[in-house]
């Protein structure tokens, strides 16, 4: 009987993740007597909500709760009924209710309000809903990945977690990309970060950390498109707008309404003598990267160096886990291998970009046609970004790693969300953890 | 804690321009919008335009359309209105305000005399 | 351009007393189920401050006794009990379209 586990003495936790196209929501799991532990906390289970994201319901509030449902019912299920009354759960708004907010205060607190109110109906203990900063979500991305990579922990293992894991204690630096920001945030290597809101100082585990780290709104992927769409169509001399960023052959009809819809948009608006516009494909990665630079201000740094649109960067330093619409990009072009150099890449993006728009249907006849269509444009932005927004190079690409989940935990800013709001990550080292009944001495 | 500073008085002459500032602190400065409203008489009030400081856009009320210009510098977190070709009329004071929709913060306001 | 009308434009109130001010616009200021008015108080030398948005939610720090009703085209702002402190300009204001538009603004006294 000395080696039988007693029952789990176990904790869950809830985050849902209301990003600008969809929310998704996890449940985290973790021993009650090991809550200080570093990487004790796993995610136990994931559930993407069914629909877009929460900022799309202003028209339509009433029908948050039923969009909200079958995920909640899920996490009921996975949950012991026992349990149900201590698993905290967090809602937390991205970009896409920033966005949303920047319009109007009253239709953010409004679909927050009636978030609140649905989520409020669950037997868990909702600890409300609110939109997080862009600092925020870069801290807490960044949180994640180091946590989950054991690089918080004291103890040095001889063993690897994963395959790009580095044997020590350097952090990773994070790299999100979201539908309608991106973020980056990393430890500088001795350099002062001259921009007071790109500063954070963190203590965790007995040891202190300088971290940078920036979002840029209106950058995420969905976002980038709107403004290089109504940036190209200020020029064309007609309601045709011939663009590199899709395949040959490929039309679609824009509403000129929805393409200023957003604030992401504002700087290029103007009259336009018509109400549509037909984007036709022409499927040049070149011409198309070309085009996404044009979204970078480069003119203006008044720091020692920039990203772009005058905001400090400092000088890369270490090992990137790139994840979220990073990660998923380049996994559906099959990019993510840690042997593909930055010009394999480039060269698969322009062979992937010139195939004809009948040949890519045919080949992904599983794939909805709205997001395989822009598959083309958001791995030539991703290039864009990292290489000219955030200054990678051929050598330094090699230092980016396209991370979906580590340890059966996806990448993201949830779970260093989480531990932050349950105190699960002390500012000082514990002195000592006792061993789980469920350890074989 | 939000606050909005503006620059102070400016005495200008008719005919001329003036650009008064409004510095921003205590939030994401890129995360709203920033509002401009003229009140003359310490009774009337009347909406400018606003600019994003995220991007540089900016609306108008059409009556100030043409004769008044908003900037924004996002490093010092600083918004800007110029106003041009200025009468008698433009002596008022002028507020920025934080908001989207709602003008929940507004700086002290910059007291603009129009006189030769 | 929306028009809001204020009334009364000066209004004396005794201490203790309810004061109501109205506003009316002159087409909806209604949009997604939320009213976008806003009633602002202003003293001599100081900016607007909010007291009222979404035309019946109270600002941040706003005593109880300011209240805010209406919808469509028909608001009010109600102070009850009337204080010495409250003496000062009032103004209604929209925001439901461009050009934003305020009220003429209401002067308000302790009788």
């Known amino acids: 009987t000395q080696n039988k586990a007693l029952p789990e003495n176990v904790k869950y936790g809830i985050v849902l993740d209301a990003g600008s196209s969809h929310t998704s929501l996890y449940i985290y799991k973790w021993p009650a007597e090991k809550e200080n532990d570093t990487g004790v906390v796993h995610q136990s289970a994931e559930c993407r909500v069914k629909g877009p994201g929460i900022s799309k319901f202003v028209q339509k509030v009433n029908e948050i709760g039923i969009y909200l449902t079958d995920c909640m019912e899920a996490a009921r299920e996975a949950i012991p009924r026992s349990q149900h009354q201590e698993t905290p759960v967090y809602l937390g708004a991205t970009a896409g209710m920033r966005l949303l907010r920047m319009e109007s205060e009253e239709l953010a607190d409004r679909v927050l309000d009636v978030v609140e109110r649905s989520l409020s109906n669950y037997p868990f203990d909702f600890q409300g809903a609110r939109i997080i900063t862009g600092q925020e979500e870069g801290a807490y991305g960044w949180i994640t990945i180091n946590y989950l990579l054991g690089k918080f922990s004291q103890k040095t293992r001889w063993f690897s977690i994963v395959p790009y894991e580095t044997n020590n204690q350097e952090t990773f630096g994070a790299l999100d990309l979201g539908g309608a920001s991106t973020q980056v945030t990393f430890v500088p290597q001795n350099q002062t970060i001259e921009s007071p809101d790109n500063a954070l100082q963190f203590r965790l585990y007995g040891k202190d950390y300088n971290v940078y780290t920036h979002s840029f709104l209106c950058y995420g992927k969905d976002q980038a498109l709107w403004q290089k769409l109504a940036k190209d169509i200020q020029v064309a001399s007609n309601e045709i707008l011939r663009d590199p960023c899709f395949h040959p052959g490929y039309k679609k009809v824009v509403n000129v309404s929805d393409l200023y819809k957003t604030p992401c948009t504002k700087r290029f608006e103007m009259t336009l003598p018509f109400q549509q516009f037909e984007i036709q494909g022409i499927g040049n990665y070149q011409q198309c990267h070309q085009s996404i630079l044009e979204l970078f201000n480069t003119s203006y740094c008044p720091y020692s160096q920039c990203a772009f649109n005058g905001i400090f960067l400092p000088p890369l330093q270490g090992d990137f886990g790139a994840f979220s619409a990073f990660y998923f990009v380049m996994k559906f072009l099959n990019l993510t291998s840690e042997k593909v150099s930055q010009e394999k890449v480039t060269e698969m993006m322009k062979k992937f970009c010139a195939q004809p728009w009948e040949e890519i249907k045919t080949s992904y006849a599983g794939v909805k046609e709205k997001y395989l269509s822009e598959y083309c444009f958001s791995g030539t932005y991703i290039l864009s970004l990292l290489l000219q927004g955030y200054h990678f190079t051929a050598d330094s690409w090699e230092h980016i790693h396209f991370i979906g989940k580590i340890q059966g935990s996806d990448a993201g800013w949830t779970l260093g969300y989480m531990l932050n709001l349950t105190n699960m990550i002390p500012a000082e080292q514990p002195l000592s953890t006792p061993l789980s009944h469920s350890t074989y001495v | 804690e939000v606050q909005l500073q503006q620059s102070g008085p400016e005495l200008v002459k008719p005919g001329a321009s003036v650009k008064m500032s409004c510095k921003a602190s205590g939030y994401t400065f890129t995360d709203y919008n920033m509002h401009w409203v003229k009140q003359s008489h310490g009774r009337t009030l009347e909406w400018i335009g606003y600019?994003?400081?995220?991007?540089?856009?900016?609306t108008f009320n059409q009556k100030f359309k043409g004769r008044a210009t908003l900037t924004v510098n996002t490093s010092s977190r600083t918004a800007y209105m110029e106003l041009r070709s200025l009468t008698s009329e433009d002596s008022a004071a002028y507020y920025c305000?934080?908001?989207?929709?709602?003008?929940?913060?507004w700086g002290q306001g910059t007291l603009v005399t129009v006189s030769a | 351009d929306i028009v809001l009308t204020q009334s009364p434009a000066s209004l004396a109130v005794s201490l203790g007393q309810r004061a109501t001010i109205s506003c009316r616009a002159s087409?909806?200021?209604?949009?997604?189920?939320?009213?976008?008015m806003y009633w602002f108080q202003q003293k001599p030398g100081q900016p607007p401050n909010l007291l009222i948005y979404g035309a019946s939610n109270q600002g941040s720090g706003v005593p109880a006794r300011f209240r805010g009703s209406g919808s469509g085209t028909d608001f009010s702002l109600n102070i009850h009990p009337m204080e010495a402190d409250d003496t000062a300009m009032y103004f209604c204001q929209q925001t439901k379209e461009v050009p934003y538009t305020f009220g003429g603004g209401t002067k308000l006294e302790i009788k």
């Open positions: 600019i994003v400081p995220l991007n540089g856009g900016s």
């Open positions: 305000a934080r908001g989207g929709t709602r003008f929940a913060y």
């Open positions: 087409e909806s200021v209604d949009n997604f189920g939320v009213s976008f």
